[in-house]
Structures are given as C-alpha cells and as structure tokens.
C-alpha cells in the first residue's frame, strides 16, 4: 500500500481466483484513543472499533472510503482505492490502446517546436467518475523539472455503438534547451482513477521524436505565362522554432484531386516556393518535416488550383 | 575550416557535408526510429556518447558570439563516431557490406572532421568507451543506439552548420 | 495488367513527319499522365512532353517546342507522339511512359523505332 | 536544365558482388530523384522513387540515397539479371532530365 496523495491510498494486488489479498492497517488520525469506531462509504454498519482498524482487501466490494467517528462526529477518512496486477502485468482497463506507432500505446504526445512544450492525449470509453493526474519530468534517476497543467476533456467522438473520449494535457519543460541534442528522454506519467480503481500509464520519448510542425501557412499561387505551372509559395509556420535558418524544414508539395486515386503532381523541396501543374478540380497543397531528422510530418496546407 | 587558432570553416561544404551525413545516417537504419531503444536499459552504452549539451554554444546567438566552442563539440563527436563506426561493433558478426550506408557515414564523418580540423592542429578529443559485446544479438542493438543517437547528433550538426552557411559565411 | 502497346518502326525522310501511336490498357486512359521519352542508338534518355489525356492538357521539353505535338484520344485510349521537320539526329527509339505521377514513369511501351535516313 | 551527372559510365563486377552507383545534380534537387534499370533492347523500370522510396515488386537488394545533389543506388549482392544500364532522372523541375547512364558489366 502507498499513498497516492493526502488520505488516498493505492492497494497493490495480484488479481487471481481465490487470491489472498492484501492486509491493511487503516490509523485513525486523531489523538482520540477511545470510543472510534469504523464505516466504509455510506454505509452505516460498523466494521470495527478502535484507533486502528485491520482488513484483508480483495476484491473491489474491500475499496472505498473507510471513515473513523467518534460520538457521530466525524474524525478522518482514508480512501482506498485498487491497482490491479494480473499474470504480472497491472491493468490497463481505463485507457484505450491507441496502437500507433506500436501496441500498448496508451498516451501519445506531440510538440509543434522544440521550445520545450508538448501536448499530450489520451483516448476513454468511460464518462463518469473519472480523474486524472499527470506528473512529468526530463530524466528518472536525477529529473529535471517539467510542469504540466489539468488533464482535460478535448474531445468527444463516436465510433460505432461507442462513445469515445479524449483528454489531453500540456507540459513545457522548465529550463528547455532547444539548440541542444537530448540525452535524457522526457518521461510522462497519468494516474488514472475511475471509481476505486487505480492504473498508472507512462510515456518516455525525446522532444526530437515528436515533433510535428504546424501545417505551412499563407499559401499562395501565381499562374506562369504560357505555361500549365503554377509557382505556388509559403511561409513557416508561427509556431515553429527560430531562427529559421537554424531550425529549418523541408517540404512536399502536391496537386491531387478530390479522390486520392486520381493522379497527382508531387515535389519535395527545402526552399518555400515550388513550381507545379494545376489542374481544373484540383487543390495544391503543401506539408513541412524538420529538415535534419526524420519526425512526423504535419498535417497539409490546401488552396484550390482555380 | 575550424582550426584551433579561431578562424573561420567553409560554412557551405560542411553544411553539405552534415545534411549528407542526416541522410545517410537515416538511411544506415530507417526503421532504427520505430523501435523503442529506451526499453532496452541502454544507460551503461550510450550515455557516453558526447552529446551537444546546453552549453557548447551549438545555439544560434553562441555561434555568433564565438562559433568555436561549439565546432570544437562537433569536432569531438565526429572523431567519437568515427571511431565507433570502425569499432568491432560494426566490424564484427553479423558483418556489414563494405558499401553499406554504414560505410558511407563512417567516410563522411572523417571528412567533416577533416573539414573542421585540417592536419597539424589539435584539439583534445574524447576517449571511445571500451563497449565490446559479446553476442551478435548484443552488438545488433548497440548498433541500432548508437546509429540513432548519431542521427541525433547530426541533426544538431547540420543545423549548426546551415545557420552558420546563412549567418556567418564571410 | 496496365500495358502501353506501340505502333511500328518507321523510315522517314530528313523534313518529314512522324506520328506514332501508343495504346493503354488494364486501366482508365484518363487516370494517368502520358509521356514521350526517346533514345538515340548507344545513347542516353531523353524527354520529350507529357500530356494529360483528361484535359489535353501539354508540356514539351523547350528543345522540341514547336516541332512536336503530343494528342490523346480517350475514345480509342491511345496517346500520339508527332515530331515535324525530322532530321538524322531524329533517329531514335520513342517510348511512350504513364503514371499518376506526373514526374516519374511507371509503365512503359516497348518502343517505336524512327529511322530518319535520306 | 538541371544536368545530371553518372558515374561511372560503366563498372564491372560479378555475381555476389555490392554495386554503388552515384548521381549528381547541377543544383539542389531535394529527393527529386529516380532510378531506372535498361536492359538491351528493352524499355527501362522503375526501380527506386524519391531518392530512397522502394517500389513494389522491385527486389530489397536494390536500394538507393541521398539529397540535395548528390545521390546513390546500391545493388546488394549481385544477380545475373541485374546486369544492365541504370540512370537516374531528376523530377525537381521541367524539362525532366536523366543522367547519362551506367552500365553494370559482367566481369
């Protein structure tokens, strides 16, 4: 058992048939000696008597809020809440499993520069009776520090008979150095709680690795004489880090229509211009990649040919 | 070229050469960026590698300042790299081709730090950690990490040298 | 199977005209971009124009601007390479190449030899 | 015209043998680049796009790299029907340019 923060308590069990369970030892936080007795959550039944109270938990029906009184006054609580470990591996019921890049891909993290700041998110089914806490932190065994704000809902979708839930959190690292190459990864961790149950998720990635620019901004076309090609140009995007002839990005331009089976004008190039062929229908658009290491690329930029 | 003495490198080659070496070092081992390295308690192999720290003056207003700092961190890692690239743990089982990209990176490391410190003039270069593994298995995943912190590195490099290319080229 | 099937050698004389054929089937003639691209005898490749059959749309290399027209009938799926004014330095094996791509080719005919000899 | 530059115009190897052929542009051409495989009397194939990306159907010991000017195809333990011409092709800008070619010999 350990302390996940004032008066809550997280149970570690090995979750089996007929499993032992856990015994507990619950202190009531009073300097009263007599006449405490015990309740768990609204229950008025008295589970025990005395500044401590001793139970085996097992099972879920075991977790909740115990609560010392003493002559119908309330003392202290202790929350008690389940943290499952099943064949060795601890649950991960809360969390979808996103798969990408790989399985068990629980929380997935982006930065749009290398100032530091990241996004995280997260992906639910459930809706009700839901928190989460997100600690982070540049290294484990000697951390740097990392800040990061409150968990929130960003998004709602449905899929299928499901409704699905998005949470997200942004962190920005402390002292972020972003001309330096990372030696020490970035770690996340979210404490999850829905009603008793306890899980923890974590993520280690270097800033490098996640990035992912903004898409290219202000598009623009400029028809050439007697020509089928268009000179299409751009800019960096605001969020992008600076200089940019530091922090440089490279891009793909591409003409397609509607339907990506229709055919397509597609170049790669360093500078913000290119020249391709427009055609009735058709959009231009144009996506940006860090220049020197091979991250995502960003979302696309689009302007119709006409 | 970056000689000890302070005068200025041949900003343009050495930014070719650097985006030549990002290029090659994805292309030694694409797919090195979709294994989770870290899983593989790595802290004994490759932390010693020198890294472009906050204070090398890699950053853009300490190029401007003074570039040497900075070009002599490079200079260190190319000569580390190197040499790990020609260490048994690329030469040995399982073996690679000798025109592998491998190959190619460990030519143009040389010639970027050739590029930053020409012949008679010195500067102190860090010891190469004595990392011998023993299975082939081993020596696979050491490859991996080191390819993908080089990739790190590199970047970094190129970065330096491309802002220096547009900034500070006479 | 995405095939181009070209039409026959041809000897032409120095001035003359050529047109030659190219036929696409295994996929909707629209669909991709048709190029020409010629060979002279132990020489290197050389291209020529694309055209995109959808809309007639054309580009030419500027060395044959003016002497080369490149035509698509979608009716019959078939693409024409037509070179004017043939000189010796003409003579060459012409392949017509597709793609959805614009600026690469994916699928090749097997080539037409135009012989220009006085 | 952006010029393209093989080298060299031809190589001998043998069977088993690792094969690089390099390709250089007049000016910057990104990734814009392909590799094309000619045997004699037959039209070329499409052996690499975009400097590194494979193409289906292609083997894996064909592989190719580089940007900006210059770039490289490899052909990873030889096979008797890999001898033949190969020339790279810019696609960064019209008109669309080839090298001049390689021939892989056998030796």
């Known amino acids: 058992i350990w302390e996940l923060k004032k008066d809550v308590y997280v149970v570690e069990l090995d979750w089996y048939p007929d499993a032992p369970g856990e015994m507990v030892v619950l202190t009531c936080d009073t300097p009263e000696e007599d006449g405490i007795t015990w309740t768990l959550d609204q229950s008025s039944e008295v589970l025990g008597s005395g500044k401590t109270l001793t139970i085996q938990v097992k099972e879920f029906g075991d977790a909740g809020q115990y609560t010392c009184h003493k002559g119908g006054e309330v003392l202290s609580h202790s929350l008690l809440l389940l943290h499952k470990k099943e064949d060795g591996i601890w649950s991960t019921d809360i969390l979808k499993d996103q798969k990408e890049p790989k399985n068990k891909t629980f929380l997935r993290c982006e930065a749009k520069n290398y100032s530091g700041r990241f996004t995280c998110w997260w992906l639910t089914t459930i809706s009700t009776d839901l928190t989460f806490s997100v600690k982070s932190s540049r290294g484990s065994s000697d951390p740097q520090g990392v800040t990061c704000g409150a968990a929130t809902l960003s998004a709602e979708r449905v899929r299928g008979d499901n409704k699905e839930y998005e949470y997200s959190v942004e962190c920005q690292e402390d002292s972020a150095c972003p001309a330096a190459e990372e030696s020490l990864p970035i770690e996340v961790m979210v404490d999850a709680v829905h009603k008793l149950k306890y899980e923890n998720y974590t993520s280690s990635f270097f800033i490098r690795d996640i990035i992912k620019p903004d898409p290219p901004k202000n598009l623009q076309l400029k028809p050439l004489k007697n020509s089928r090609q268009v000179e299409v140009s751009w800019e960096y995007p605001d969020t992008w880090s600076t200089p940019h002839s530091y922090f440089s990005l490279t891009f793909c331009v591409q003409v397609q229509g509607k339907s990506k089976r229709e055919k397509k004008d597609r170049v790669f190039t360093d500078k913000t211009s290119a020249t391709v062929i427009c055609r009735k229908n058709a959009s231009i658009s144009v996506r940006a990649q860090d220049r020197y290491y091979s991250s995502s690329w960003s979302e696309w930029a689009s302007v119709p040919c006409s | 070229r970056a000689v000890p003495g302070g005068s200025s490198p041949a900003w343009t080659q050495c930014q070719q050469l650097s985006q030549k070496l990002c290029t090659l070092a994805w292309s030694a081992h694409p797919l090195v960026g979709h294994m989770d390295l870290r899983e593989e308690g790595d802290e004994e192999t490759t932390n010693d590698v020198p890294h472009i720290q906050c204070g090398d003056g890699c950053d853009p207003q300490g190029l401007r300042d003074n570039s040497q700092f900075c070009l002599q961190r490079i200079h260190q890692g190319l000569i580390f790299y190197e040499k790990l690239l020609g260490s048994d743990i690329f030469t040995g089982e399982p073996s690679l081709l000798p025109d592998s990209p491998v190959g190619q990176l460990h030519a143009s490391l040389l010639g970027l730090s050739q590029l930053l410190q020409p012949e008679g003039h010195h500067w102190e270069t860090q010891q190469i950690p004595s990392l011998s593994p023993s299975q082939p298995w081993q020596r696979l995943l050491l490859r991996f990490k080191i390819l993908r912190s080089l990739q790190a590195f590199v970047a970094v490099a190129a970065r330096v040298f491309a802002h220096g290319a547009a900034t500070l080229s006479p | 199977e995405v095939q181009l099937v070209q039409s026959g050698a041809e000897v032409k004389k120095p001035g003359a005209t050529v047109k030659i054929s190219c036929k696409a089937s295994?996929?909707?003639?629209?669909?991709?971009?048709l190029h020409w691209v010629r060979q002279a005898p132990e020489k290197g490749l050389e291209w020529m124009g694309w055209?995109?059959?959808?809309?007639?749309?054309?580009e030419y290399a500027p060395k044959f601007q003016g002497r080369v027209t490149i035509t698509a009938d979608t009716s019959t799926d078939t693409g024409y390479l037509e070179l004017s004014s043939l000189r010796s330095e003409d003579t060459a094996v012409y392949y017509c190449?597709?793609?959805?791509?614009?600026?690469?080719?994916?699928?090749w005919g097997q080539g037409t030899l135009v012989t220009v000899s006085s | 015209d952006i010029q393209m530059t093989q080298s060299p115009s031809s190589v001998s190897a043998s069977v088993g043998d690792r094969v690089t052929i390099t390709c250089r542009a007049s000016?910057?051409?990104?990734?814009?680049l392909h590799w094309y495989q000619q045997k004699p009397g037959k039209a070329p194939k499409l052996l690499i796009k975009f400097a590194s990306q494979s193409i289906s159907g292609v083997p894996s010991r064909f592989s190719g790299s580089g940007s900006g000017t210059d770039f490289s195809l490899t052909i990873n333990s030889l096979q008797p029907e890999d001898f033949a011409t190969y020339y790279c092709?810019?696609?960064?800008?019209?008109?669309?340019?080839f090298g001049g070619g390689t021939k892989v010999e056998i030796k």
């Open positions: 092709q810019q696609s960064n800008s019209f008109p669309l340019t």
């Open positions: 000016q910057s051409i990104s990734i814009n």
């Open positions: 190449a597709a793609n959805k791509e614009l600026r690469y080719f994916d699928v």
């Open positions: 055209i995109d059959p959808e809309n007639g749309d054309t």
């Open positions: 295994g996929y909707t003639f629209s669909d991709y971009y």
